[in-house]
């Protein structure tokens, strides 16, 4: 049985290329260790953007060079993706795995469409 995972349908990145969204899962058990993976789907290709395993009540720890950061609160994970450009526009899918204790559960959200608009370059001023 798949675990239910909810995430917003659409998010607009800010002018600095940062987008944030909440990934919420309906935990069937009392998980102590959870793995969250962000996948990007574009042109029927799915690639892993970032992943983190965290202990319940602790911070998410992504790799040092990751473009993702996040915090957790209960069954919610607040994810932030940085350094986005217009070409990164796409569907970002949240995958949650309850790694421990057993049994293992996994759920995949429907995805959040993140729109990224590159900022216009500032015109030269004559002042």
């Amino acid at each position: 049985k798949a675990m239910h995972v909810a995430q917003p349908a659409v998010v607009l990145a800010n002018s600095r290329g940062t987008a944030s969204f909440v990934c919420e899962y309906a935990s069937p058990g009392k998980a102590t260790e959870v793995r969250v993976t962000v996948l990007r789907q574009a042109d029927s290709q799915v690639t892993e953007v970032c992943a983190a395993t965290y202990m319940m009540g602790n911070e998410l720890t992504f790799l040092d060079d990751s473009i993702c950061t996040g915090t957790s609160s209960g069954n919610q994970v607040n994810l932030t993706i940085q350094g986005l450009r217009a070409m990164d526009t796409g569907l970002y899918i949240c995958k949650v795995e309850l790694m421990y204790p057993p049994p293992y559960y996994m759920g995949i959200g429907n995805g959040t469409q993140i729109y990224v608009i590159d900022p216009e370059p500032c015109p030269d001023s004559d002042f």
């Epitope: 049985k1 798949a2 058990g29 009392k30 102590t32 260790e33 395993t53 202990m55 790694m99 421990y100 204790p101 057993p102 049994p103 293992y104 559960y105 996994m106 759920g107």
Partner: antibody, heavy 122, light 112 residues
Framework: EVQLLESGGGLVQPGGSLRLSCAAS????????MSWIRQAPGKGLEWVSG????????DFADSVKGRFTISRDNSKNTLYLQMNSLRAEDTAMYYC???????????????WGQGTLVTVSS | QSVLTQPPSASGTPGQRVTISCSGS????????VYWYQQLPGTAPKLLIY???NRPSGVPDRFSGSKSGTSASLAISGLRSEDEADYYC????????????FGGGTKLTVLG
Amino acid sequence: EVQLLESGGGLVQPGGSLRLSCAASGFTFKAYSMSWIRQAPGKGLEWVSGISNTGGSTDFADSVKGRFTISRDNSKNTLYLQMNSLRAEDTAMYYCARLGYSGYDDRGMDVWGQGTLVTVSS
Amino acid sequence: QSVLTQPPSASGTPGQRVTISCSGSSSNIGSNYVYWYQQLPGTAPKLLIYGNSNRPSGVPDRFSGSKSGTSASLAISGLRSEDEADYYCQSYDSSLSGPVVFGGGTKLTVLG
């Protein structure tokens, strides 16, 4: 081939210590939680301890709590069970097992080692 | 004493169908999957059924599992002499300090 190989068993006196090892091969060890299960001579299976894939979470049966510790070294693909203050009732065959999963499915303990015998006697 | 209850023994003749039961409670079988393991004499246990009724690759379809409420059962049809072994049910329990619980095991004897 997916394989688990236990070692470190033997004869030890009551109150003594022993460290069991379980070497994994043929799969991505760091992706799986692991367990130790024991079987006393002529008896059934008893779950002893479990550890998450990262090593950050552990559990123990009440019968061994405070005496046994479980750990893993993902760089060496090895699981450990440190057994202290051993008692005669700890005499058993000790198995390590992988807690499997695939897709959405929990697969239970899908890979077992051949076991290592621990005998506690004076 | 085991958390899950199994009959200590079962028997049948070659070709027969044999069923082994496993009884638990709402905190284990009632709210979790059931797994079955086969232990042939002198060997390590082997996963036979996972997720109540699924067979890993390589396990013959003569073996089938089912669950209803707080009980589960393993059925072996077309019994063979090589099926003589100990069979253990297993589940997870949310109310205990350790998450894994086993049945006491059932010794299956193939007669004749």
